[in-house]
């Protein structure tokens, strides 16, 4: 069978080889498509409801005024010339529709290096067959599931037209110290060969590099955190970041009900004040960051305090946000 590719909505003429150029003709067209069950026979003297789909022209050719998805299938003509010689024509018709230019919607203007970011969603509407969407970074194809690249795809079919809408959401994790203005684009590749890809306009989000956080320092006075009963302990939370973050205090892992302050003074120490203290610095851009923990203890007169203080672990690092 001869392969024919026809655009949806366009007319199509299939020649009946060997047919006399004008009536009287002995010919018959048979079609097996999405509109037929088994074979439908159309003859030159036909004419009727099927004319809206396909009709035999005076020269014996079959005319389809506007090809549709349901016209995909096999078309056969059997003709006999004036001398009684029979000729058969056999066509396999496939249809296509090129969508409008794809677009990137919900695109990000800024990405953060080192963490997953949604770049945008590529949308293509009105294709047949469905075709595929692919993403490009600086002109080179992006491969999903490689180097922090992930793609979520969705295909929908219009209930009336049968045409496809494709959606592809791109997530990337930009490398630290990489290109500050990467160029992303998306392209639609048709499901049928010999049709060029359609590419979106590019987008160029900025990549923001988060400044690595310097550690929150907790300084205890007296050094080591051991103090005689009735003495005073001063805890100072030092944060290099600008602007100064809010400082809250924790004792034994529980927030203390105090107003934010970089200094915590414990006057007239008693047994109830013993425990492990830390401070939490809350940055508007980074979220909370906890210091190491220090242990405050009471020493009875005549006891030697610990030389370096009984210092706890390094804290929890950056707290996860609930």
């Amino acid at each position: 069978a001869q392969n024919i590719t026809a655009r949806i909505g366009e007319p199509l003429v299939l020649k009946c080889k060997g047919a006399p150029k004008k009536p009287p003709q002995r010919l018959e067209w048979k079609l097996n498509t999405g509109r037929t069950e088994a074979w439908k026979v159309l003859s030159p003297q036909g004419g009727g409801p099927w004319d809206s789909v396909a009709r035999v022209l005076p020269n014996g050719s079959l005319f389809l005024p506007a090809v549709g998805i349901q016209d995909e299938g096999i078309f056969r003509c059997q003709a006999m010339n004036r001398n009684g010689k029979e000729t058969k024509s056999n066509y396999r018709v496939r249809v296509y529709q090129i969508p409008g230019k794809p677009e990137i919607v919900d695109s990000a203007s800024e990405l953060t290096a080192g963490v997953p970011n949604k770049v945008g969603t590529c949308v293509s509407e009105g294709s047949y067959p469905a075709g595929t969407l692919s993403w490009h970074l600086d002109g080179k194809p992006l491969v999903p599931n490689e180097k922090g690249v992930s793609v979520k795809e969705q295909t929908r079919r219009h209930p009336e037209t049968g045409l496809f809408t494709l959606q592809s959401e791109l997530m990337v994790t930009p490398a630290r110290g990489g290109d500050p203005r990467p160029t992303f684009s998306c392209s639609f590749s048709p499901g049928l060969p010999r049709h060029r890809a359609l590419r979106t306009a590019p987008i160029q989000p900025r990549v923001w590099e988060p400044v690595p956080l310097e550690e929150v320092q907790l300084v205890v006075e007296p050094e080591g955190g051991a103090v005689a009963p009735g003495g005073t302990v001063t805890l100072t939370c030092e944060v290099p970041a600008q602007p100064s973050p809010q400082i809250h205090w924790m004792k034994d892992g529980v927030p203390l009900p105090l107003p934010p302050s970089p200094v915590l003074i414990l006057p007239e120490i008693g047994p109830q004040d013993q425990g492990t203290y830390s401070c939490v610095a809350t940055h508007s851009s980074h979220g909370p960051q906890e210091s190491r923990a220090v242990s405050i203890s009471i020493i009875e007169p005549g006891e030697e305090g610990p030389t370096a203080g009984s210092v706890g672990g390094s804290g929890l690092g950056t707290l996860a946000l609930a």
């Epitope: 004419g47 009727g48 409801p49 809206s52």
Partner: antibody, heavy 119, light 107 residues
Amino acid sequence: EVQLVESGGGLVQPGGSLRLSCAASGFTFNNYWMTWVRQAPGKGLEWVASIDNSGDNTYYPDSVKDRFTISRDNAKNSLYLQMNSLRAEDTAVYYCARGGDILDSLHFWGQGTLVTVSS
Amino acid sequence: DIQMTQSPSSLSASVGDRVTITCRASQDVGIYVNWFQQKPGKAPRRLIYRATNLADGVPSRFSGSRSGTDFTLTISSLQPEDFATYYCLEFDEHPLTFGGGTKVEIK
């Protein structure tokens, strides 16, 4: 909303003529075939004529061929039925309907207009 | 020309009954049969298109089926508003041919 409104019916003598009109709205008129169907009082439905979307091809049953002519004006979203040499048996309610082909078969109908052929 | 033989020409039924109406085509018409409902003084309304497809806005108690050249309209549970006349239509070939109609009356 698809709407089809017939007009032009009435009383006519045998041998006389009448022209029915159908005003279409709510859809792209020139994308569709159009059809006239009639129903004699107390009887069933009978196909009268169809026309393709361009107006180039028309179709009739033997009962009205050479007497009735279906036509359309796509610019005016209008369908017509010119009825000549009318007979008593043409008395019926005449309905205009969208479609009549393989793609869209009589999906929407008008409310009909009564044609009475009597002396 | 194709003939569409519709049966029965009338039937009496009660609300809640299952009703079946049949049309037989005199030759192969593929899937190209519609069913219509008509109430007195009103235009026909398409119920089923291409033998088995329910038209928009038509209750799911209506269904269509096909076996060769036999086409069936079924109302699974008759409702008061379903008392009307039903027609089949063949649109595979000209002349388009309607069945003779089936009048569904209250028992």
